[in-house]
Interface confidence: low
């Protein structure tokens, strides 16, 4: 049995007057079903006179009645062609057709802009059967229209593999202007021209644009959207926005800040990360960038010693990572360090100067006049040397390091001795007989170990030999060390 659907008790009174065949708009339909995926129930209809012919697709029935009269062509009745309404309002529209009852398996589907509307749309199809014909009304409702609902809607019906298409119903949703392009924040050079763009659309069209700078309108006459504002140049920061007007009212874009590029602020918090004898690692916090990216930074270094000539060393580096290792500095020296950074406009002032010191350096000169003796009676080697001349920045002498290497057939062994700073002689035990002992000495400060002296060799004979003369480094300017035995 056919049951009445819950959706509606009566058809919508969408048509002026009765349908052909005495079907009144207040008749209750036998069946009213929500449209889903194009499916409709198959019903037997009985024919009656069709409505006005349709300008779109029609289906010419090839079947004849009992009296052999040809059936008239099928077509959707004309309905409203263009609906204009405001955003968020509700709308209902429909298409209708009268179908002879000889046709089975009729389906009506809704299409928008060439695509079938499936799923969760409020589409309802109502059937009004008569003896010979069934009037079908397909209604489509939108409870709160949005701009995306704008478009051309049609009904399609398939009968016996024939497709019947209704006239389009154009839905035009009107509302306040909608921005498709808003001005963007910019950082600009002082007194240099730049452009801002604003574009908004309806419907309704046209959309007119007013520009606003710091709360005051720039143009007295509106420009049609899209609008490009050419600002000849600014001397100080300004905020711009645009107003879009149409018949429904006005919409205001976001306000965008146009900043004037300036030289950066000086870096802050310059600090010492690490110091060695000849380098200092510094870091800094960049100042405000003046609305233009930092390009590079300059580290300025001057000796803090009042007796220095006041010359400034300059080291250039990239702006990131706010770290720089200053190299080639003197040991045990005081320096003033400042940092300046630049953007496309120019250099910042120098940061507050900070004081930094390098640590002691290692000695730069080896001990002089190294002499080596063999003391056979005590089975020792005596070593003597002269303290090297030290520079102040090499730091305080804390001692000496002695390297002695023992070499005989198949054996080579290096030993190291540490000697206090006051001595200028040392005694080491003979490690191997019938071997060569090679001695080198280096001075040591807190800054490290200096260079080793030239090697001095002495032969240590097997037990029982006599006559041992000293070995020594040559006087300055002489050739290689001489071994005297």
């Amino acid at each position: 049995a056919i049951t009445e659907a819950r959706e509606e008790a009566k058809p919508y009174p969408l048509f002026p007057g009765p349908f052909p065949g005495s079907l009144q708009t207040d008749h209750t339909p036998l069946l009213s079903l929500p449209h889903a995926s194009g499916y409709q129930p198959a019903l037997m209809f009985s024919p009656t006179q069709p409505g006005r012919p349709h300008t779109g697709n029609v289906a010419i029935p090839q079947v004849t009645s009992v009296e052999s009269k040809p059936l008239p062509p099928l077509a959707f009745k004309h309905t409203v062609g263009h609906i204009i309404l405001s955003e968020h309002k509700g709308v209902k529209f429909n298409c209708s057709i009268s179908v002879p009852n000889i046709y089975q398996d009729t389906t009506i589907s809704w299409w928008k802009d060439g695509k079938e509307l499936l799923g969760a749309h409020h589409a309802i199809t109502q059937f009004y059967p008569d003896d010979e014909v069934t009037a079908i009304i397909a209604s489509f409702s939108i409870t709160s229209v949005q701009r995306s609902d704008n478009g051309s809607y049609i009904c399609k019906m398939k009968i016996n593999n024939e497709e019947i298409v209704s006239d389009p119903i154009y839905i035009e949703v009107q509302g306040l202007p909608h921005f498709t392009k808003q001005p963007e924040s910019m950082n600009v050079t002082r007194n240099t021209a730049f452009n801002l763009t604003c574009q908004a659309v309806g419907p309704p069209e046209p959309v007119n644009i007013f520009w606003v700078q710091n709360s005051s309108r720039v143009n007295e006459q509106p420009e049609k959207s899209p609008s490009v504002l050419t600002v000849p140049g600014l001397t100080e920061m300004a905020v711009f926005s645009c107003e879009a007007h149409n018949d429904k009212g006005l919409t205001v874009s976001k306000g965008v800040q146009i900043n004037i590029k300036a030289i950066p602020s000086p870096p802050t918090e310059v600090s010492i990360r690490n110091s060695t004898a000849h380098s200092i690692l510094i870091s800094w916090v960049p100042g405000f960038d003046g609305y233009s990216p930092f390009r590079n930074c300059s580290i300025q270094v001057k000796e803090a010693d009042p007796l220095s000539n006041g010359s400034v060393m300059i080291f250039n580096t990239s702006a990131l990572p706010h770290l720089y290792q200053i190299k080639q500095l003197q040991a045990l020296a005081n320096y003033s360090i400042g940092v300046s950074c630049m953007n496309e406009i120019g250099w910042s002032a120098v940061s507050p100067w900070i004081l930094a010191s390098t640590t002691e350096g290692a000695p730069s000169v080896a001990p002089l006049n190294v002499t080596v003796f063999l003391n056979e009676s005590s089975d020792n080697v005596d070593i003597r040397w002269m303290k090297p001349p030290t520079k102040q920045q090499d730091g305080e002498l804390v001692g000496y390091r002695i390297s002695h290497v023992w070499q005989s057939a198949g054996i080579s062994k290096e030993l190291l001795e540490e000697v206090g700073q006051n001595g200028s002689r040392a005694r080491i035990s003979v490690q191997v007989h019938n071997a060569t002992c090679t001695v080198r000495i280096a001075a040591v400060t807190r800054g490290g170990v200096g260079p080793f002296s030239d090697p001095v060799k002495i032969f240590i004979p097997a037990h029982g030999w006599v006559d041992y003369a000293p070995s020594s480094t040559p006087a300055p300017g002489n050739a290689d060390p001489v071994l005297i035995i």
């Epitope: 924040s185 800040q257 900043n259 802050t268 918090e269 600090s271 990360r273 870091s283 916090v285 960049p286 100042g287 405000f288 960038d289 609305y291 990131l320 706010h322 770290l323």
Partner: antibody, heavy 121, light 107 residues
Framework: QVQLQQPGAELVKPGASVKLSCKAS????????MHWVKQRPGQGLEWIGM???????NYNEKFKSKATLTVDISSSTAYMQLSSLTSEDSAVYYC???????????????WGTGTTVTVSS | DIQMTQSPASLSVSVGETVTITCRAS??????LAWYQQKQGKSPQLLVY???NLADGVPSRFSGSGSGTQYSLKINSLQSEDFGSYYC?????????FGAGTKLELK
């Protein structure tokens, strides 16, 4: 004096979203980074991310799909939208400000009052 | 990401005592460290920035020290208003991370 005002509390259902606000006053809003920090009940502090009205945003990778930071320059207000909320998101959320344009100077001398977000059905 | 390991997790002390809280970074953060105090139900407050600098209005009994990866906050002669939680935070690049906190309780 510099102030960051935040609503006291928000009660939201699991799966929903919430948009927290932080209204700044007493300083030039467009010159400073605004940071957001999360603190779960009885727990420590977690940095969510930061936004500069004139520059851009920088998120903690952990919160990239959870938080969206925006600003409204006209009202000097920063916003953080939290999406797909679960009980793990129940926490106090603070906004906090520090100095402008300083890559390595992001400590916070001014904190908001904090908004307590409770996620419960 | 840089991990900040704070210790101890809690500390029971009396007024007048001196306490030291430490914070260890998983890598060198070059003194880019801040300390905060947070009282129950309140927002955190900055105490120390750049490892050693006292923030405006912070009493001189607070002091920060350290470099590299090891940092500490010292509170001399603890006052009753000093009880609460303390957090360290590095700002050597993003993401910024905080220590888990140290809760200072009255013995």
């Amino acid at each position: 004096q510099v102030q960051l005002q935040q609503p006291g509390a928000e009660l939201v259902k699991p799966g929903a979203s919430v948009k927290l606000s932080c209204k700044a006053s007493g300083y030039t809003f467009t010159s400073y980074w605004m940071h957001w920090v999360k603190q779960r009940p009885g727990q420590g502090l977690e940095w969510i991310g930061m936004i500069h009205p004139n520059i851009n945003t920088n998120y903690n990778e952990k919160f990239k799909s959870k938080a969206t930071l925006t600003v409204d320059i006209s009202s000097s207000t920063a916003y953080m939208q939290l999406s797909s909320l679960t009980s793990e998101d129940s926490a106090v959320y603070y906004c906090a400000k520090r100095s402008p344009y300083s890559n390595y100077d992001w400590y916070f001398d001014v904190w908001g009052t904090g908004t307590t977000v409770t996620v419960s059905s | 990401d840089i991990q900040m390991t704070q210790s101890p997790a809690s500390l029971s002390v009396s007024v007048g005592e001196t306490v030291t809280i430490t914070c260890r970074a998983s890598e060198n953060i070059y003194s880019n460290l801040a300390w905060y105090q947070q009282k129950q139900g309140k927002s955190p407050q900055l105490l120390v920035y750049a490892a050693t600098n006292l923030a405006d209005g912070v009493p001189s009994r607070f002091s920060g020290s350290g470099s590299g990866t090891q940092y500490s906050l010292k509170i001399n002669s603890l006052q009753s208003e000093d009880f609460g939680s303390y957090y360290c935070q590095h700002f050597w690049g993003t993401p910024l991370t905080f220590g888990a906190g140290t809760k200072l309780e009255l013995k």
